[in-house]
């Protein structure tokens, strides 16, 4: 059994290495930004945009949603590609959980404040279901402060 788990871990690791989780990250960021916009936030306020050039330019993602994008432009594309990637983990729930954890970790330092972090986490938990996939039963999405990119 231990041997099987070791092989499973190796297989999961190589699956994760070949997965492109960026579309999932983009899709979720667009989603929470659109939700914030619909609650009356000024969509063009650069000070609240986690990808605003006014912040550390090295942290800015060139494919992040611009204020224009937040209306949903390209959103279905990110979601379609994201679901295709998650679908690769469908028959390995533990590996699906690791993929979700990686998405959380990669985006954690781009999330502004506790509220946005909780919202991102909530959307992330719903992601497999949104893709018509089974969500992992137990999946801890907590990230130690100062999460870093695992790419």
């Amino acid at each position: 059994r231990q041997q099987w788990e070791l092989q499973g871990d190796r297989r999961c690791q190589s699956q994760l290495e070949r997965a492109n989780l960026r579309p999932c990250e983009q899709h979720l960021m667009q989603k929470i930004q659109r939700d914030e916009d619909s609650y009356g936030r000024d969509p063009y306020s650069p000070s609240q945009d986690p990808y605003s050039p006014s912040q550390d330019p090295d942290r800015r993602d060139p494919y992040s949603p611009s204020p224009y994008d937040r209306r949903g432009a390209g959103s279905s594309q990110h979601q379609e590609r994201c679901c295709n990637e998650l679908n690769e983990f469908e028959n390995n729930q533990r590996c699906m959980c690791e993929a979700l954890q990686q998405i959380m970790e990669n985006q954690s330092d781009r999330l502004q404040g506790r509220q946005q972090e909780q919202q991102f986490k909530r959307e992330l938990r719903n992601l497999p279901q949104q893709c018509g996939l089974r969500a992992p039963q137990r999946c801890d999405l907590e990230v130690e402060s100062g999460g870093r990119d695992r790419y």
Epitope: N20, Q26, P62, D69, Q77, E88, E90, Y151
Partner: antibody
Framework: EVQLVESGGGLVKPGGSLRLSCAAS????????MNWVRQAPGKGLEWVSS????????YYADSVKGRFTISRDNAKNSLHLQMNSLRDADTAVYYC????????????????WGNGTTVIVSS | EIVLTQSPGTLSLSPGERATLSCRAS???????LVWYQQKPGQAPRLLMY???TRATDIPDRFSGSGSGTDFTLTISRLEPEDFAVYYC?????????FGQGTKLEIK
């Protein structure tokens, strides 16, 4: 050397069938999504079909849906396109292409192409 | 289906000149999913640009890409003899993954 070599093209009558193959070498085939793209004589490129690494997601162009079937054999490093109910409009050079993505930012692209195999559908 | 329309159909220019090729989408395309390819007669297509503006490996810096939403542009700052070819844009975010009809860049 990273290489894709298509085979299986030829002359076939309308309504007939052909099976195209693409042999991959020089890279870990199972790590990549794969695509078929075709080009009719004197015309532009037309995307035909794509298949993900473990064959879990498959897409087709509307023009071939229900007639063509894409498949892959990761153990044999090969990609296939089963073409049934062929029509004159299917006459083209068929390219096999590897899809990769930018690890740091995410965009996808077809970076390795075969030289193509020619399919002629004519009575 | 996202329809990509390239213009002009044919562009006649001389070496040394600047070429501007346009790709317009029927609905918004994320920059992440916009790719440009180059194809010469009798050859397979070659990857040129991805993510709308990132040059592929070994592509000279005279090639640049820009745009967002529904309008994308490929610019060749100073044409070299080997740049005369057909250029295609493609979106690969939503299936079916569509190509534009191509722009033929020919020597004037």
């Amino acid at each position: 050397e990273v290489q894709l070599v298509e085979s299986g093209g030829g002359l076939v009558k309308p309504g007939g069938s052909l099976r195209l193959s693409c042999a991959a070498s020089g890279f870990i085939f199972s790590d990549y999504n794969m695509n078929w793209v075709r080009q009719a004589p004197g015309k532009g490129l037309e995307w035909v079909s794509s298949i993900t690494r473990s064959s879990r997601t498959i897409y087709y162009a509307d023009s071939v849906k229900g007639r063509f079937t894409i498949s892959r054999d990761n153990a044999k490093n090969s990609l296939h396109l089963q073409m049934n109910s062929l029509r004159d409009a299917d006459t083209a050079v068929y390219y096999c292409a590897r899809e990769d993505f930018d690890v740091s930012t995410g965009p996808y692209y077809m970076d390795v192409w075969g030289n193509g195999t020619t399919v002629i559908v004519s009575s | 289906e996202i329809v990509l329309t390239q213009s002009p159909g044919t562009l006649s220019l001389s070496p040394g000149e600047r070429a501007t090729l346009s790709c317009r989408a029927s609905q918004s395309v994320s920059n992440m999913f916009l790719v440009w390819y180059q194809q010469k007669p009798g050859q397979a297509p070659r990857l040129l640009m991805y993510g709308a503006s990132t040059r592929a490996t070994d592509i000279p810096d005279r090639f640049s890409g820009s745009g967002s939403g529904t309008d994308f542009t490929l610019t060749i700052s100073r044409l070299e003899p080997e740049d005369f070819a057909v250029y295609y844009c493609q979106q690969n975010g939503n299936s079916p993954y569509t190509f534009g009809q191509g722009t033929k860049l020919e020597i004037k």
